[in-house]
Interface confidence: medium
């Protein structure tokens, strides 16, 4: 009679699963781009902003050729978990200025959580280890000021945008190697 309602589809084709992950990543990329533009519109950025607690970009044009699926999925999941933590922090600690970006920030968080669940499912289907590599979790302290939280938001959305952009490229490339 088939699997019970609500249970994940058992797929014998990892390419289909990868396709689904790519679609979700693309969708999240579009949302992030839109929210980053909204941020720039509402709170113009004075130059590039960085945040020490954000993960360093995992992929670059030079590394695309040597990508391996296990490494990409594991690193992507770790990085996206870090971004999820940062988005949650922004929503709670950002103060009144960032409250004006709701419900968009909330929707972004929900889609990020959905993509993370999809990546976890893909990794289990491909029998890849779920354990994330040991990385020190830098505690996210309070922003120094409201202006500081706006700068942090620019950095978080900018970093997430770049990460997702490379993730789409990397996943598409890996799909051709499956």
């Amino acid at each position: 009679p088939g699997p019970p309602a609500g249970s994940p589809r058992v797929s014998s084709d990892p390419r289909a699963d990868l396709d689904s992950a790519v679609l979700l990543t693309r969708s999240l990329l579009a949302d992030t781009r839109q929210l980053a533009a909204q941020m720039r519109d509402k709170f113009p950025a004075d130059g590039d902003h960085s945040l020490d607690s954000l993960p360093t970009l995992a992929m670059s044009a030079g590394t695309l050729g040597s990508l391996q699926l296990p490494g990409v999925l594991t690193r992507l999941r770790v990085d996206l978990m870090s971004y999820l933590r940062h988005v949650q922090w922004l929503r709670r600690a950002g103060g009144p200025s960032l409250k004006t970006l709701e419900p968009e920030l909330g929707a972004l968080q929900a889609r990020l959580e959905r993509l993370l669940r999809r990546l976890q499912l893909l990794m289990s289907r491909l029998a890849l280890p779920q354990a994330a590599p040991d990385q020190p979790v830098i505690p996210l302290g309070p922003p120094a000021s409201a202006w500081g939280s706006i700068r942090a938001a620019h950095a978080i959305l900018g970093g997430l945008h770049l990460t997702l952009d490379w993730a789409v490229r990397g996943l598409l490339l890996l799909k051709t190697r499956l």
Epitope: F43, R91, R92, G95, S97, K99, P142, A146, W147
Partner: antibody, heavy 117, light 110 residues
Framework: EVQLVESGGGVVQPGRSLRLSCAAS????????MHWVRQAPGKGLEWVAV????????FYADSVKGRFTISRDNSKNTLYLQMNSLRAEDTAVYYC??????????WGQGTLVTVSS | QSVLTQPPSASGTPGQRVTISCSGS????????VNWYQQLPGTAPKLLIY???LRPSGVPDRFSGSKSGTSASLAISGLRSEDEADYYC???????????FGGGTKLTVL
């Protein structure tokens, strides 16, 4: 040293207006969201309004919406609260408070507003 | 009627540990940070705990905050006479788009 000094309080008749000021010093005023919080005699704290660091976003408590206006002049390091159509229940000590995010880390000493005929 | 619920009073003897509770909902405590303020008689409130459980510099480690779900609590150990004050919890409320306070708890050191 961070300092917030409120002024402009006094006795006013119901229906009249009053403008409170909060002079800030010892920090970069334009980097911080600012709030007004009030406390009626013998009662608890009640949040009134907040304005974002650059002045474009404002939120108000339902009890003052449409009557009170929060504003700021970053060039003068000053926060304002314009109070119109004052009622007896607006009688309170009004505090301005600085927020780096979700908490008030510095408060002024307060200014008393008495609405009475 | 305050959005956050606190007991109106609490008491203890010097050296004792007292806990003050603060109950809210998913739109305030459940999704935002809780802060605690101390107001000594005749003075302006002062930040005591922020980000649920962090202490500003200068606040003794006898004061601690915790949060679980839609409730928070403030614990004061090694109670001293100078701790006699009103204590307020507060959080941003997403539904009201504003800050909400508890009604305050008057702490008496017996």
């Amino acid at each position: 040293e961070v300092q917030l000094v409120e002024s402009g309080g006094g006795v006013v008749q119901p229906g009249r207006s009053l403008r409170l000021s909060c002079a800030a010093s010892g920090f970069t005023f334009s980097h911080y969201d600012m709030h007004w919080v009030r406390q009626a005699p013998g009662k608890g704290l009640e949040w009134v309004a907040v304005i974002s660091y650059e002045g474009s976003n404002k939120f108000y408590a339902d009890s003052v919406k449409g009557r009170f206006t929060i504003s700021r002049d970053n060039s003068k390091n000053t926060l304002y609260l314009q109070m119109n159509s004052l009622r007896a229940e607006d009688t309170a000590v009004y505090y301005c408070a600085r927020t780096p995010g979700s908490h008030f880390d510095y408060w002024g000493q307060g200014t008393l507003v008495t609405v009475s005929s | 009627q305050s959005v956050l619920t606190q007991p109106p009073s609490a008491s203890g003897t010097p050296g004792q540990r007292v806990t003050i509770s603060c109950s809210g909902s998913s739109s305030n405590i459940g999704s935002n940070y809780v802060n605690w303020y101390q107001q000594l008689p005749g003075t302006a409130p002062k930040l005591l705990i922020y980000y649920d459980d962090l202490r500003p510099s200068g606040v003794p480690d006898r004061f601690s905050g915790s949060k679980s779900g839609t409730s928070a609590s403030l614990a004061i150990s090694g109670l001293r006479s100078e701790d006699e004050a009103d204590y307020y919890c507060a959080a941003w409320d997403d539904s009201l788009s504003g800050v909400v306070f508890g009604g305050g708890t008057k702490l008496t050191v017996l």
